[in-house]
């Protein structure tokens, strides 16, 4: 009988975002071995890649994925068309944006080919693991004599999205943070004339349409004070 | 297979009101955030509205915000938007989708309001 070990993946919800299902232990042959555990991300809702730690396995093995969606019309068991490989291992599978149905249960398999019992089943919901591309484009615009508008792009449904808007001066230490909604706009009401300002941006899925916990990567910074160009009060949007 | 029926649109003087229903059949209404959009005559689909799977969360279209109330009751399998001092310009059809609103999911036969001055 298989045993189930539910694991916590750092999103969890009223149901398991995260099951994990192994043969059980009854000696340690090598079928009893435990599988590494799968991670999957979705990018931009664009690709998905589900990728495990080939090098914890005790020698080199290509372990094979499948998958499935669980009580869905896409239940029917897939294999992985395109593997990642690490030193010619495979240590991954991409999946492309008509394979990630977001809002059904995502079912992966890993299993070693030459021990067929020696398999792990995960279960994911694939709206907690979308990681959006940072945000593009960042502008701003001089309100009044103190006040700043910092306005960007993303690549992605802005009403999905929340963000992350960091800023500091050349005389801080730290950044000083502010969470913005979808509606992605951030003003800076007091700005002091006399220094230099550095602004960036991070993007996440939350939580419209999914409960992230992962970020995107920063956006470039950009800079707005005492080194910038006087010409024109009204825009800059300098990037480093 | 999917099926979304609209109903309640109609026709009102501007600064009226209607409320619209969306009913839900062939997937798993709860599991998904669902969506309002719209489309006047000669223009394309504009997104309205986007409520998440568990009615937590609610987004809106800059052109509606505070005049217009999206929620959802997932027992029942419906989708709802109520719209409050209706303008001209909100005449269009309305559409309600699965899922936060990319396009990609085919719309319900849509129903019409008309709000006239």
């Known amino acids: 009988l298989n045993t189930t070990i539910l694991t916590p993946n750092g999103n969890e919800d009223t149901t398991a975002d995260f099951f994990l299902t192994t043969m059980p232990t009854d000696s340690l042959s090598v079928s009893t071995l435990p599988l590494p555990e799968v991670q999957c991300f979705v990018f931009n809702v664009e690709y998905m890649n589900c990728t495990w730690n080939s090098s914890s396995e005790p020698q080199p093995t290509n372990l094979t994925l499948h998958y499935w969606y669980k009580n869905s019309d896409n239940d029917k068991v897939q294999k992985c068309s395109h593997y990642l490989f690490s030193e010619e291992i495979t240590s991954g599978c991409q999946l492309q944006k008509k394979e990630i149905h977001l809002y059904q249960t995502f079912v992966v398999q890993l299993q070693d080919p030459r021990e067929p019992r020696r398999q792990a089943t995960q279960m994911l919901k694939l709206q907690n693991l979308v990681i959006p591309w940072a945000p593009e484009n960042l502008t701003l615009h001089k309100l009044s004599e103190s006040q700043l508008e910092l306005n960007w792009n993303n690549r992605f449904l802005n009403h999905c999205l929340e963000h992350l808007v960091q800023y500091r001066t050349d005389w801080d230490h730290s950044w000083t943070e502010q969470s913005v909604d979808y509606r992605h706009k951030f003003s800076l009401p007091s700005v002091d004339g006399q220094k230099r300002y550095t602004f960036r941006v991070r993007s996440r899925f939350n939580p419209l349409c999914g409960s992230a916990q992962h970020w995107s990567e920063w956006s470039h910074p950009i800079h707005w004070g005492s080194n910038t160009s006087k010409e024109n009060p009204f825009l800059f949007a300098l990037e480093a | 297979q999917v099926q979304l029926q609209e109903s309640g649109g109609g026709s009102v003087p501007a600064g009226g009101s209607l409320k619209l229903s969306c009913a839900a059949s062939g997937f798993s209404f709860s599991s998904y955030p669902m969506t309002w959009a719209r489309q006047a005559p000669g223009k394309g689909l504009e997104w309205v509205s986007t409520i998440a799977s568990d009615g937590g969360s609610t987004a809106y279209a800059a052109s509606v915000e505070g005049r217009f109330t999206i929620s959802r009751d997932n027992a029942k399998s419906t989708l709802y938007l109520q719209l409050n001092s209706l303008k001209t310009e909100d005449t269009a059809m309305y559409y309600c989708?699965?899922?936060?609103?990319?396009?990609?999911?085919?719309p319900g036969q849509g129903t019409q309001v008309t709000v006239s001055s």
């Open positions: 989708t699965k899922g936060y609103g990319d396009g990609t999911p085919a």
